[in-house]
Interface confidence: low
């Protein structure tokens, strides 16, 4: 017995050949011995099964001997076992349906859990294995799960069912849900705008919901909310702002978030959170911000950094072109009686300038100039 | 320590079948997928078959087939390669190879290789 | 099929130099910023060695001396000091796409 896969939803075409290369009166029918179509001269008969609707041949085929039976729109359902009856002589196909569906929405946030669904006909004892768009490879029976989606399991999820050595392969969207960086990080000097951008990692028509940033500045205590806003349909209104620091919210997307002066208060950590409209859990992404003073007070030039530095990055003061005075993996060094000249105040990582702040030291009878 | 063991080469006229086999042990056979690779003599390396740590998902490059299937036991820990109407073209090293599937795919240990020559 | 191209095709070079191999995909191998791209080493009649894997991690056990970059459709294999048992044939794959495809070879020899 021929078995043919077919998907739910899809047309399946079983053939059915004659020796005689004419047309000549043929059946096709059920297990159950209902006839669904079949011929009667030139013209197409249609029996009273279930498929009657779904059901067709192509006439075209006829006088070479060919009377496929398609099926249009299948259904798990329609897995039976079909007969042609040609000749005093009977073509068995077997027929088996199946269908994947994800559990609930293909768009998924960053963290979720994907379930597919296999709907399979009663007897029939598939397997599935699914490729996601990284390479992965996940086996399973009726269902298969994959916790802990990442950005990368975006895209198009390839799923083969096998059953009886045949294969049927589904291809299934899987959108992400998720900030393009987990974390990002600003370098900047005292005094200088701080933009702070948070582009998604996807593309919908329309997309709503709220969010807000929650801060922790290094010199705080506790973290406190920057910033809650909506989003409705792309557009962005703030709801509610922080008076300390006076933060602008551009109104379309990418959000987007000046802070118009950088100062050591501000330095530390926040967590921007979206929540979207019918979706359970939040995206996050993560911003840190580095603020550099250089200063010069009586007889002594120093330079700090505040915020979340790495321990192995490193902190110098050297006077223009010449080699650094002082360089320590700390967040302050200083120089005592410094010579008149342009300062520089180098954070640098593995020998990467991050953050470059100059002073001028002038003579001693004079007051320093910060360009 | 993974070790990887192919048996069942030889030479056999063309048109005939041969049965490869790959005893692996140092882990555990079957949580990986499975693969044969082989290299003609004097030439570069040439996948030919994969199958699923369970067996139930099989690949195989389009000149073999209808030809090749692949198999496991994983009672056994063997793999295994039937070749059936094979050619001159077929001539080659066949190596068991274990495929790690959980990131990129790539062959992380290999056997030593066996040889089949297929001439009348 | 995805076609890997190698350059050189054959290398003579002297224990302590430098060499790069490079492996030229016929299309991306690339999946969501994943790159699907293996290097290999092969001895005379030895079996092939996985070296790098996903482009650039270093596989269990192979010296730090080799290392993998590139992404997209073009990939190097570099060894940063030659060393005598690292005279053999090199090998790029792609596991992007079925079939799987190896690159022709790089033989390197010593000078």
């Known amino acids: 017995k021929k078995v043919v896969l077919g998907k739910k939803g899809d047309t399946v075409e079983l053939t059915c050949t004659a020796s005689q290369k004419k047309s000549i009166q043929f059946h096709w029918k059920n297990s159950n011995q209902i006839k669904i179509l079949g011929n009667q001269g030139s013209f197409l008969t249609k029996g009273p099964s279930k498929l009657n609707d779904r059901a067709d041949s192509r006439r075209s085929l006829w006088d070479q001997g060919n009377f496929p039976l398609i099926i249009k729109n299948l259904k798990i359902e329609d897995s039976d076992t079909y007969i042609c009856e040609v000749e005093d002589q009977k073509e068995e196909v077997q027929l088996l349906v199946f269908g994947l569906t994800a559990n609930s929405d293909t768009h998924l946030l960053q963290g979720q859990s994907l379930t597919l669904t296999l709907e399979s006909p009663p007897g029939s004892s598939p397997s599935v294995q699914c490729r996601s768009p990284r390479g992965k490879n996940i086996q399973g029976g009726k269902t298969l799960s994959v916790s802990q989606l990442e950005l990368q399991d975006s895209g198009t999820w390839t799923c083969t069912v096998l059953q009886n050595q045949k294969k049927v392969e589904f291809k299934i969207d899987i959108v992400v849900l998720a900030f393009q960086k987990a974390s990002s990080i600003v370098y900047k000097k005292e005094g200088e705008q701080v933009e702070f951008s948070f582009p998604l990692a996807f593309t919908v028509e329309k997309l709503t919901g709220s969010g807000e940033l929650w801060w922790q500045a290094e010199r705080a205590s506790s973290s406190k909310s920057w910033i809650t806003f909506d989003l409705k349909n792309k557009e962005v209104s703030v709801k509610r702002v922080t008076q300390d620091p006076k933060l602008q919210m551009g109104k379309k997307l990418p959000l987007h978030l000046t802070l118009p002066q950088a100062l050591p208060q501000y330095a530390g950590s926040g967590n921007l959170t979206l929540a979207l409209e019918a979706k359970t859990g939040k995206l996050h992404q993560e911003v840190n911000l580095v603020v550099m003073r250089a200063t010069q007070l009586q007889k002594n030039l120093t330079c700090e950094v505040w915020g979340p530095t790495s321990p192995k990055l490193m902190l110098s003061l050297k006077l223009e072109n010449k080699e650094a005075k002082v360089s320590k993996r700390e967040k302050a060094v200083w120089v005592l009686n410094p010579e008149a000249g342009m300062w520089q105040c180098l954070l640098s990582d593995s020998g990467q300038v991050l953050l470059e702040s100059n002073i001028k030291v002038l003579p001693t009878w004079s007051t320093p100039v910060q360009p | 320590e993974v070790q990887l063991v192919e048996s069942g080469g030889g030479l056999v006229q063309p048109g005939r079948s041969l049965r490869l086999s790959c005893a692996a042990s140092g882990f555990t056979f079957s949580n990986y997928g499975m693969a044969w690779v082989r290299q003609a003599p004097g030439k570069g390396l040439e996948w030919v078959a994969t199958i699923s740590y369970d067996g139930s998902i099989t690949y195989y490059r389009d000149s073999v087939k209808g030809r090749f299937t692949i198999s496991r036991d994983n009672s056994k820990n063997t793999l295994y390669l039937q070749m059936n109407s094979l050619r001159a073209e077929d001539t080659a090293t066949y190596y068991c190879t274990r495929e790690e599937q959980y990131s990129s795919w790539y062959f992380d240990f290999w056997g030593q290789g066996i040889l089949v020559t297929v001439s009348s | 099929d995805i076609q890997l191209t190698q350059s050189p095709s054959s290398l003579s070079a002297s224990v302590g130099d430098r060499v790069t191999i490079t492996c030229r995909a016929s299309?991306?191998?690339?999946?969501?910023?994943?790159?699907?791209m293996q290097w290999y080493q092969q001895k005379p009649g030895k079996a092939p060695k996985l070296l790098i894997y996903?482009?650039?991690n270093l596989a269990s056990g192979v010296p730090s001396r080799f290392s993998g970059s590139g992404s997209g459709t073009d990939f190097t294999l570099t060894i940063s000091s030659l060393q005598p048992e690292d005279f053999a044939t090199y090998y790029c794959?792609?596991?992007?796409?079925?079939?799987?495809?190896f690159g022709q070879g790089t033989k390197l020899e010593i000078k």
């Open positions: 794959q792609q596991s992007k796409d079925d079939p799987y495809t």
């Open positions: 299309q991306s191998v690339s999946i969501s910023s994943h790159d699907l």
């Open positions: 996903d482009a650039f």
